[in-house]
């Protein structure tokens, strides 16, 4: 960067060289080049010179004024005209920030998305801060007292094995900058309370001809978690509005679930699954389309294979994904 | 790719315990699925025995209950299978496996033979 | 316990016949039948979970089928490498149960 080059003098911010968006600022150049009684000495902001707000303190030093700094990252730098010089010399440069301090870190939630082998915690760290920002996530064995910190940028995954003080944690988040520092409230956890089983993936569809046609959503995850607790939902791809359903889940085999549709119509679906009583929810699957076939349905496509279903004509959709992928996104 | 292999004595005493180890790599034991203990036979009947699940929990074929114990070391990546109190009975080849979810055991070990006899 | 019964200890076939292995469960598994296949010194093999879902890498000659207590599984054109004992496993709940093998045999 910028800080890199050698100077022949010194530049400085004054309140600071990271301070507060929207402060007035000034920044100071001082030359020290030999054989050199500087004519003028000029100010450059990412490359472009100033024209405004300089005044020249003695013969070796100037200052260039900033009312309300609103740019997160600049590079400055300043030069000298000296006489029988034709071009002018570089004195020195700095890169200046600005931001805010960080806000109390809140809605700390530490999750174990099953088949991990981490739990992941996250937190809404408020408004952006435009500086470098650290979080130190501070988790605590109510067991054994025994305390770790893990430093992150973000959110941070923490090895299951390294939590060896038992099951119940006391979790929070420090959030430090050049700025400021605040401290998150405390989160209590039990591991075995905020598992997220394996994702629920819908597999295929087929819409069975019968007195009164109905659909059927092929549908399975790979949890380990006997009590699961699934819903899901569907609409009309023209509607805004979804349909719910509920399920209480086994998964010791693939999932099928029955809607009766109206025929000829696009139909999008989703599920999402919670162990039994627990917090926190899968994200919802992907988009699962399936049209439904018009009253004398028409074979479109051919599952990968079934021999449940003996007789009546099936309109088949498949999905892309597999059974046993494991997709994760937000926290539901 | 994941693996799995057996080890322990070929031969036991009746009436001493049986103590057996499955190695697993290419998957950590402490990550996911329940890791199980099957044995076989000499006529081919398999029958489950029991699991560790990933959270080290353990479930047990309730006609072993009383003598079976499943323990594990994580640093290790390794699982293991106690049987107390062994008779002739208890003479078979011994599979450790991995379980698709809460379905079928996708992943077994090449299995270990093991004779009951004084 | 459930039990699982396979009726046929033997099942003799020829190359490129099809052939159906049945197994009956002593009460509803729903469709949480596993099938496996195990050549002689092997260890059992997954080809089928929940009745009638091939496992990965499973040729698409192997099929499974029913629900409740029924249950079928078919090849539809044997291969000499088929030649092995098939068991089917209930993985509706513990203890988990086998069937007790059928042998298919070449005639």
């Known amino acids: 960067g910028i800080t890199n080059i050698n100077c022949s003098g010194h530049i400085w911010v004054e309140p600071a060289t990271i301070f507060k968006m929207g402060m007035n600022i000034s920044i100071y150049c001082q030359a020290a080049i030999k054989n050199c009684q500087p004519r003028k000495l000029h100010f450059y902001k990412n490359g472009i010179k100033e024209r405004f707000q300089i005044t020249r303190i003695n013969k070796t030093t100037a200052r260039l004024w900033y009312k309300n700094f609103l740019e997160p990252h600049a590079s400055m730098y300043c030069t000298a005209e000296c006489p029988k010089h034709f071009q002018e010399t570089l004195i020195c440069g700095k890169d200046i920030s600005s931001g805010y301090p960080p806000d109390i870190p809140d809605e700390v939630t530490c999750v174990i998305y099953e088949y991990s082998g981490n739990m992941t915690c996250t937190w809404n760290a408020g408004k952006l801060t435009y500086i470098d920002t650290k979080y130190v996530v501070h988790v605590k064995s109510l067991e054994t007292e025994e305390e770790q910190q893990y430093l992150t940028s973000s959110y941070i995954n923490i090895s299951t094995d390294s939590l060896q003080g038992g099951k119940k944690y006391l979790v929070w988040v420090q959030a430090a900058n050049a700025l400021g520092m605040e401290e998150s409230k405390q989160l209590q956890i039990h591991l075995d309370d905020i598992v997220i089983p394996s994702a629920a993936v819908i597999s295929r569809a087929e819409t069975i001809n019968a007195t009164v046609p109905k659909t059927i959503i092929y549908w399975d995850s790979q949890t380990t978690i006997e009590k699961v607790s699934c819903e899901m939902r569907y609409k009309a791809t023209t509607n805004q509005t979804w349909n719910v359903k509920e399920f209480d889940t086994n998964f010791t085999y693939v999932q099928q679930s029955e809607f009766y549709l109206e025929p000829n119509i696009k139909y999008v679906f989703q599920v999402r699954c919670q162990e039994t009583g627990k917090r926190y929810w899968q994200p919802w699957s992907s988009l699962f389309f399936h049209k439904t076939p018009e009253t004398v349905p028409q074979v479109t496509s051919k599952a990968f294979q079934h021999d449940t279903w003996n007789s009546g004509l099936t309109v088949a959709s498949i999905s892309t994904g597999h059974l046993t992928s494991d997709n994760r996104g937000d926290i539901g | 790719q994941v693996q799995l292999k057996e080890s322990g004595p070929d031969l036991v005493k009746p009436s001493q315990s049986l103590s057996l180890t499955c190695t697993v790599t290419?998957?950590?034991?402490?990550?996911?699925?329940?890791w199980h203990w099957i044995r076989q036979f000499p006529g081919n009947k398999l029958e489950w025995m029991g699991y560790?699940?990933?959270?080290?929990?353990?479930i047990y074929n309730p006609s072993l209950k009383s003598r079976i114990s499943i323990t594990r070391d994580t640093s290790k990546n390794q699982f293991f299978l106690q049987l107390n109190s062994v008779t002739t009975e208890d003479t078979g080849t011994y599979y450790c496996?991995?379980?698709?979810?809460?379905?079928?055991?996708?992943?077994w070990g090449q299995g270990t033979s093991v004779t009951v006899s004084s | 316990d459930i039990v699982m019964t396979q009726s046929h200890k033997f099942m003799s076939t020829s190359v490129g016949d099809r052939v159906s292995i049945t197994c009956k469960a002593s009460?509803?598994?729903?469709?949480?039948v596993a099938w496996y296949q195990q050549k002689p010194g092997q260890s059992p093999k997954l080809l089928i979970h929940?009745?009638?879902y091939r496992y990965t890498g499973v040729p698409d000659r192997f099929t499974g089928s029913g629900s409740g207590t029924d249950f079928t599984f078919t090849i539809s054109s044997v291969q000499v490498e088929d030649l092995a004992v098939y068991y089917c496993?209930?993985?509706?709940?513990?203890?988990?149960?086998f069937g007790s093998g059928t042998k298919l045999e070449i005639k």
């Open positions: 496996a991995r379980q698709l979810g809460l379905k079928a055991m996708d992943y």
């Open positions: 290419g998957y950590s034991i402490t990550s996911g699925y329940n």
């Open positions: 560790i699940h990933y959270s080290s929990g353990t």
């Open positions: 009460q509803d598994v729903r469709t949480a």
């Open positions: 929940s009745a009638s």
């Open positions: 496993q209930q993985h509706y709940t513990t203890p988990y149960t």
